[in-house]
């Protein structure tokens, strides 16, 4: 079983970053950390999408990784997509320092995110609390600014 993974985020614009993943035990939480730069100040949706396909850019990654066929939610919600990691927060300089611990994603098994795509979005994720159908699917987080396939790290 892989215990470490990494993702290099790139897009058409200025947004780029490196995100690391570590899971010390197969059923334990995954630590997610790293930095993303080139963002506008504020919150940006942060999700693992289903496919590790970036052939046509970030749109090829498909919808949120959702093997349990649940509604979109926030990372602390029981009802959420596996890939729902909430929001990252960019400062005035456009830098988001990411530090997340999540117990739903995994680096092995049915919830394995390796080989899938990590995406940072244009807008804040409303965590499934909004008033339209899209809120229950994507959180209205808007376009995909940057993405990368999550790979095994040594």
């Amino acid at each position: 079983m892989a215990t470490k993974a990494v993702c290099v985020l790139k897009g058409d614009g200025p947004v780029q970053g490196i995100i690391n993943f570590e899971q010390k035990e197969s059923n334990g939480p995954v630590k997610v950390w790293g930095s993303i730069k080139g963002l506008t100040e504020g919150l940006h949706g942060f999700h693992v999408h289903e496919f590790g396909d970036n052939t046509a850019g970030c749109t090829s990654a498909g919808p949120h990784f959702n093997p349990l066929s649940r509604k979109h939610g926030g990372p602390k919600d029981e009802e959420r997509h596996v890939g729902d990691l909430g929001n990252v927060t960019a400062d005035k300089d456009g830098v988001a320092d990411v530090s997340i611990e999540d117990s739903v994603i995994s680096l092995s098994g049915d919830h394995c995110i390796i080989g899938r795509t990590l995406v940072v979005h244009e807008k804040a994720d409303d965590l499934g609390k909004g008033g339209n159908e899209e809120s229950t699917k994507t959180g209205n987080a808007g376009s995909r600014l940057a993405c990368g396939v999550i790979g095994i790290a040594q």
Epitope: G128, K129, G130, G131, N132, S135
Partner: antibody
Framework: EVQLVESGGGLVQPGGSLRLSCAAS????????MSWVRQAPGKGLEWVAN????????DYVDSVKGRFTISRDNAKNSLYLQMNSLRAEDTAVYYC?????????WGQGTLVTVSS | VIWMTQSPSLLSASTGDRVTISCRMS??????LAWYQQKPGKAPELLIY???TLQSGVPSRFSGSGSGTDFTLTISSLQSEDFATYYC?????????FGQGTKLEIK
């Protein structure tokens, strides 16, 4: 077509109680957070309370905490607001709306008047 | 609590005019902002959410912009049915609050 229809408003004395209902149709009610928003006569809008799609979480504006209770029955596609210990300042049109933090379709509203 | 200042409170304009309504926050709210229109005796209707996303069925003459603490609703060419009261609303932090409203009246 999404429809939200409120009922249960009326005239009540200070200290009294009322239960508002909202009947929802035209969408999968159990998939959405829902809210109550009120508007005092001639005034602006005030969010009152919300409830998660499965009823497991609720939030309230401070001014109604401990007096109002939001609930839902997904089998009946219905949202409720139990209002106790009513005060004159609770006088308003109460709207049911889809969404927990921002609000898509709204109902037509039901008027609650608290007066002796 | 996030305090919101919506301006102007009253706006007089003519059909065909381009008008803007401003909403300023006491702190940054990212993209957690919505706009609503309300006509007398009617329920509010959602126009825009997430700062700039137009609700389905809302005419394209309505647009939203801004970031951080300063946001704007623009109507590019006023139609007679646009004379109403407009509210901004933040959903960044609890309690979710509305601006005090802007009444758009016929000049």
């Amino acid at each position: 077509e999404v429809q939200l229809v409120e009922s249960g408003g009326g005239l009540v004395q200070p200290g009294g109680s009322l239960r508002l209902s909202c009947a929802a149709s035209g969408f999968t009610f159990s998939s959405f957070w829902m809210s109550w928003v009120r508007q005092a006569p001639g005034k602006g809008l005030e969010w009152v309370a919300n409830i998660k799609h499965d009823g497991s979480e609720q939030d309230y504006v401070d001014s109604v905490k401990g007096r109002f209770t939001i609930s839902r029955d997904n089998a009946k596609n219905s949202l409720y607001l139990q209002m106790n210990s009513l005060r004159a300042e609770d006088t308003a049109v109460y709207y049911c709306a889809r969404g927990g933090i921002w609000f898509g379709p709204w109902g037509q509203g039901t008027l609650v008047t608290v007066s002796s | 609590v996030i305090w919101m200042t919506q301006s102007p409170s009253l706006l007089s304009a003519s059909t065909g005019d381009r008008v803007t309504i401003s909403c300023r926050m006491s702190q940054g709210i990212s993209s957690y902002l919505a706009w609503y229109q309300q006509k007398p005796g009617k329920a509010p209707e959602l126009l825009i959410y997430a700062v700039s996303t137009l609700q389905s069925g809302v005419p394209s003459r309505f647009s939203g912009s801004g970031s951080g603490t300063d946001f704007t609703l623009t109507i590019s060419s006023l139609q007679s049915e646009d004379f109403a009261t407009y509210y901004c609303q933040q959903y960044y932090s609890f309690p979710y609050t509305f601006g005090q409203g802007t009444k758009l009246e016929i000049k």
